[in-house]
Interface confidence: low
């Protein structure tokens, strides 16, 4: 499995789109800051088998897609940017899916690294709960956008390490 230069470009475009989605200054939302306890240890990439790392990355992309494809999300962000964001995420998920199948085979895929995947799911549950509690306010969305940018940066770094192993 080769996480190609194209995939790397997709990563950069995803981060760029996330940056451009910003609608209000983060400085006006300081009071809404929140620690979502990003499961950083799942993105260390040292102790992982390649297939495990890819599964975690795929889950990250999937959950990000789920978060930004809700009705509340489409009301908060520029539709054009969202549409482009979806396309980039889809492309990345397709690339990662191909890699998972190539690395471990179809049968094993669903059970890959369940603990790490659950950690990512719980992380996104905390984000969803925060948005609900904040009634999907513009500042809450801005805090979440900044958080997702941070987590996508970790994903990108893990993918870089995986490419170096190729």
């Amino acid at each position: 499995c080769n996480l190609s230069q194209t995939h790397s470009l997709n990563n950069r475009r995803t981060l760029m789109l996330m940056a451009q989605m910003r609608r209000i200054s983060p400085f006006s939302c300081l009071k809404d800051r929140h620690d979502f306890e990003f499961p950083q240890e799942e993105f260390d990439g040292n102790q992982f088998q390649k297939a495990q790392a890819i599964s975690v990355l795929h889950e990250m992309m999937q959950q990000t897609f789920n978060l930004f494809s809700t009705k509340n999300s489409s009301a908060a962000w520029d539709e054009t940017l969202l549409e482009k964001f979806y396309i980039e995420l889809f492309q990345q998920m397709n690339d990662l899916e191909a890699c998972v199948i190539q690395e471990v085979g179809v049968e094993e895929t669903p059970l890959m690294n369940e603990d790490s995947i659950l950690a990512v799911k719980k992380y996104f549950q905390r984000i969803t709960l925060y948005l609900m509690e904040k009634k999907y306010s513009p500042c809450a969305w801005e805090v979440v956008r900044a958080e997702i940018m941070r987590s996508l940066s970790f994903s990108t770094n893990l993918q870089k390490r995986l490419r170096r192993k190729d």
Partner: antibody, heavy 119, light 108 residues
Framework: QVQLVQSGAEVKKPGASVKVSCKAS????????MHWVRQAPGQGLEWMGE????????IYNENFKSRVTMTRDTSTSTVYMELSSLRSEDTAVYYC????????????WGQGTLVTVSS | EIVLTQSPATLSLSPGERATLSCSAG???????LYWYQQKPGQAPRLLIY???NLASGIPARFSGSGSGTDFTLTISSLEPEDFAVYYC?????????FGQGTKLEIK
Amino acid sequence: QVQLVQSGAEVKKPGASVKVSCKASGYTFTNYWMHWVRQAPGQGLEWMGEINPSHGRTIYNENFKSRVTMTRDTSTSTVYMELSSLRSEDTAVYYCARGGLGPAWFAYWGQGTLVTVSS
Amino acid sequence: EIVLTQSPATLSLSPGERATLSCSAGSSVDSSYLYWYQQKPGQAPRLLIYSTSNLASGIPARFSGSGSGTDFTLTISSLEPEDFAVYYCHQWSSYPFTFGQGTKLEIK
């Protein structure tokens, strides 16, 4: 091709309101935020605010917040900017400009509408 | 509010000369959101440079942009007669979006 066509020049008295329109064509109207920028005679550019034509969400510059209202009509692909409590210093050319991604940001502008406030 | 200060206010040069226009931000601007526009009398502004250093469609290669943080520059390597106009830097890094006061490039 993308076109933004604005309404004609207006002359208003101090204290009155003005409503400027901007009709968009050549692209999917609801996909891009529309912005309003004004320019007083011989002066620089000043951003007034923006509206998301899809659901009408607006973000205004605090300098205008109490006096400006931006609306849209998706059936005619038109956005409107209404400025109330006009004063002489509001005499300016008002432009609509389309938002977008990267090189599309403010790449398209209306021709401008001159609003003159005079007693 | 991020205040953008352009210098000089007026720049008098001859065709063929190199023009360097500066834009200084009161606080740091993400370079992805620093743009340059050209405006001629009676016309709407025209996008020249986006994201600090990228040339907009149809803009000649003699225009270039650079900078980061609080200091940005627009350079015209060899002035053509049609380049004499007013130039504005613009940021949409944070609300409210702002423009510099403009630099008027005039024929010497």
